[in-house]
Interface confidence: low
């Protein structure tokens, strides 16, 4: 008799793929535009990335550092109207993209929470949650919660409102903290909160250190669903050396939890790489005309258009990974086991019941290495085969689909491999 299938876990929509942050509409859409109506025209692009949620804004009226002139219920007219927002929601819904609204109050100001009037601002947030839930948003994000006095209790209250409306709604909190204890204490009082932090960016970017960070985080947070990012708002390029971008994309998409990216991460957009741009919101490079101020400043391989046409680009890798992440059971909700491998490497397995299994091997080092996979660390349910098929490499030159002998596996500098192998009873 065939073994009984393991019961599938309850899957919320944010468990099924990546979230994509657009913190600045104008910068995302490029010069001369930057409103909700224009964003609607970019939804096909987001669909092509296979992201499951769009974290948008803030969009509300906010006069810098002025509580009285901050209205969380009103869209800043520069971004568009309620009708534009509603049209965006409807269009996103048709494309199965959920919209999460950032309600961080004083987003144009110094202290995002108006340090002197936290209580009145928190009440404003509470009222705004109900309003926007009725308007049809799928969730909320609030950032810089370390600057919010008594953050845990506020978050608990806001999560109750959000989940009270529907279990299918999501609350995301962001913090600049990288301290695990602080992160865990914020998570403890909120069972379904997604927390983005600087935890992973506090790294020496070696295989050993990254493995240790990931395993400590998973151990500390227990069975709860995690999110993975390098910061609450910034670009990957602000935290990573360029040669590790591909490696981190592979890792973020294959760790157990929800990967969270910022617009431009998929093309390796750099903060303020071009003259005159604000560091926190560089202009998205759609094509070579995206930065008209200085002719020739943008080359094709920096842009969405150029990278879309190149199967070896970072954008193509992102799309491949996002596709795998959204359809493979083992990557969607599979068990996670790390095991020993060569120095500078971080290796792990994702498996779910009798579904295809995935092996991830990441070489953080500057030299080519033998993988040295030691499966003795693994439980019997997750044993390694002798061969596995290559799904993708972060580096060019390997043939996708080719079987690789695991004992003889060698990795190029900064190479990451995603391999698949079948369940064997």
């Amino acid at each position: 008799r065939a073994p009984r299938c393991r019961e599938l876990p309850a899957q919320k929509w944010w468990h099924t793929g990546a979230l994509y942050r657009i913190g600045d509409l104008q910068a995302f859409q490029g010069h001369g535009s930057g409103n909700l109506a224009g964003l609607k025209g970019r939804l096909d692009y987001l669909s092509s990335l296979k992201v499951k949620g769009l974290v948008l804004g803030p969009l509300h009226k906010n006069q810098k550092d002025d509580v009285a002139q901050t209205d969380l219920l009103q869209i800043d007219p520069n971004f568009g109207s309620k009708e534009d927002f509603d049209n965006l929601l409807q269009s996103a819904k048709k494309k199965s993209i959920r919209v999460i609204l950032d309600l961080t109050p004083n987003y144009r100001g110094e202290n995002l929470w108006f340090s002197t009037q936290v209580d009145s601002v928190a009440t404003k947030v509470k009222d705004a949650l109900e309003f926007w839930l009725q308007a049809g948003v799928d969730g909320f994000q609030v950032r810089d919660i370390e600057n919010l006095k008594d953050a845990s209790s506020f978050l608990a209250e806001w999560e109750n409102i959000t989940k009270g409306f529907s279990e299918d709604r999501l609350l995301i909190a962001g913090t600049n903290s990288s301290d695990l204890q602080q992160i865990v204490s914020l998570l403890e009082s909120n069972k379904d909160l997604l927390l983005t932090s600087s935890y992973l960016s506090d790294s020496s970017f070696t295989g050993e250190h990254t493995k240790s960070l990931v395993t400590q985080y998973l151990n500390a947070t227990g069975n709860r669903w995690c999110s993975w990012s390098l910061s609450q708002a910034g670009l990957l390029t602000s935290f990573l050396p360029a040669q590790l971008l591909r490696l981190y994309q592979l890792m973020l998409f294959t760790l157990p939890g929800t990967p969270v990216f910022s617009y431009g991460d998929e093309i390796g957009l750099k903060a303020a790489a071009l003259p005159g741009q604000p560091v926190e919101a560089p202009v998205m490079l759609w094509d070579e005309s995206s930065f008209p101020d200085i002719p020739g400043a943008v080359s094709a391989n920096m842009t969405v258009k150029g990278q879309s046409e190149d199967p070896g680009s970072l954008l193509s890798l992102f799309r491949q990974l996002s596709d795998q992440r959204s359809k493979e059971r083992s990557l969607l909700h599979g068990d996670f086991h790390t095991f020993s491998s060569g120095p500078g490497l971080f290796s792990y397995i994702r498996h779910w019941d009798q579904n295809e299994r995935f092996l991830v091997v990441l070489n953080f080092g500057d030299v080519g290495l033998s993988a040295g996979l030691q499966a003795s660390d693994l439980p019997a349910s997750a044993s390694l085969p002798t061969k596995a098929d290559l799904v993708l490499s972060t580096q060019p030159g390997r043939e996708e689909g080719s079987p690789l002998e695991l004992e003889r596996l060698k990795l190029e500098p900064h190479e990451g491999l995603l391999l698949r192998f079948p369940y064997v009873a």
Partner: antibody
């Protein structure tokens, strides 16, 4: 194979409430993000969309009928129902239940065979 | 919400091609690619022929095709056959999260 079957009285008196039930077989009404809909067709005329109930329980109605329509879901019986209040002879029609979805698959792929409801005293 | 506008009738001889138009507004046909077409024989339930403007469900003949330009969608039937004689309805999802149908077109095969 999903099948839908309408049931309810074929004759309703004016000013009363028309009540119809659609029984779904071959699939659970609460699994998958489907739009369980009611559509009607006046004799010799075109189709008119009445409203739908989403698997989550959200309802949307034709604005011209909104004040008189209620659509509800009974997951235990795998049924959804239509109530149309204060009926007049103008509500005489063949009533169809239909399914659209899941999620953004916004077309009606399964239909009941239709049931004729006559409003007359 | 106003019904989508279709011609009341069209006709054609066997083997010919005919086109049925369906005109809506910026809130429905123009705004979304969620136009579907249904065939209905007398006394029967409607049957889905085209979805998402131009896609055919499995089992539907390639003689049926759909297209859209602006706020007008079209259904074309090529190589007309006697059994194609029926009523045809277009439908669109709208920006109010509702559906709207066309008034229907009676196709006569001469």
């Amino acid at each position: 194979q999903v099948q839908l079957q309408e049931s309810g009285p074929g004759l309703v008196k004016p000013s009363q409430t028309l009540s119809l039930t659609c029984t779904v077989s071959g699939g659970s009404i609460s699994s998958g993000a489907y739009y369980w809909s009611w559509i009607r067709q006046h004799p010799g005329k075109g189709l008119e969309w009445i409203g739908y109930i989403y698997y989550s329980g959200s309802t949307y109605y034709n604005p011209s009928l909104k004040s008189r329509v209620t659509i509800s879901l009974d997951t235990s019986k795998n049924q959804f129902s239509l109530k149309l209040s204060s009926v007049t002879a103008a509500d005489t029609a063949v009533y169809y239940c239909a399914r659209a979805g899941p999620k953004w698959e916004l077309w009606f792929d399964y239909w009941g065979q239709g049931t004729l409801v006559t409003v007359s005293s | 919400q106003s019904a989508l506008t279709q011609p009341a009738s069209v006709s054609g001889s066997p083997g010919q091609s005919i086109t049925i138009s369906c005109t809506g507004t910026s809130s429905d046909v123009d705004n979304y690619n969620y136009v579907s077409w249904y065939l209905q024989h007398p006394g029967k339930a409607p049957k889905l022929m085209i979805y998402d403007v131009s896609n055919r469900p499995s089992g539907i003949s390639t003689r049926f095709s759909g297209s859209k330009s602006g706020n007008t969608a079209s259904l074309t039937i090529s190589g007309l056959q006697a059994e194609d004689e029926a009523d045809y309805y277009c439908s669109s999802f709208t920006s109010s999260s509702t559906w709207v149908f066309g008034g229907g077109t009676k196709l006569t095969v001469l």
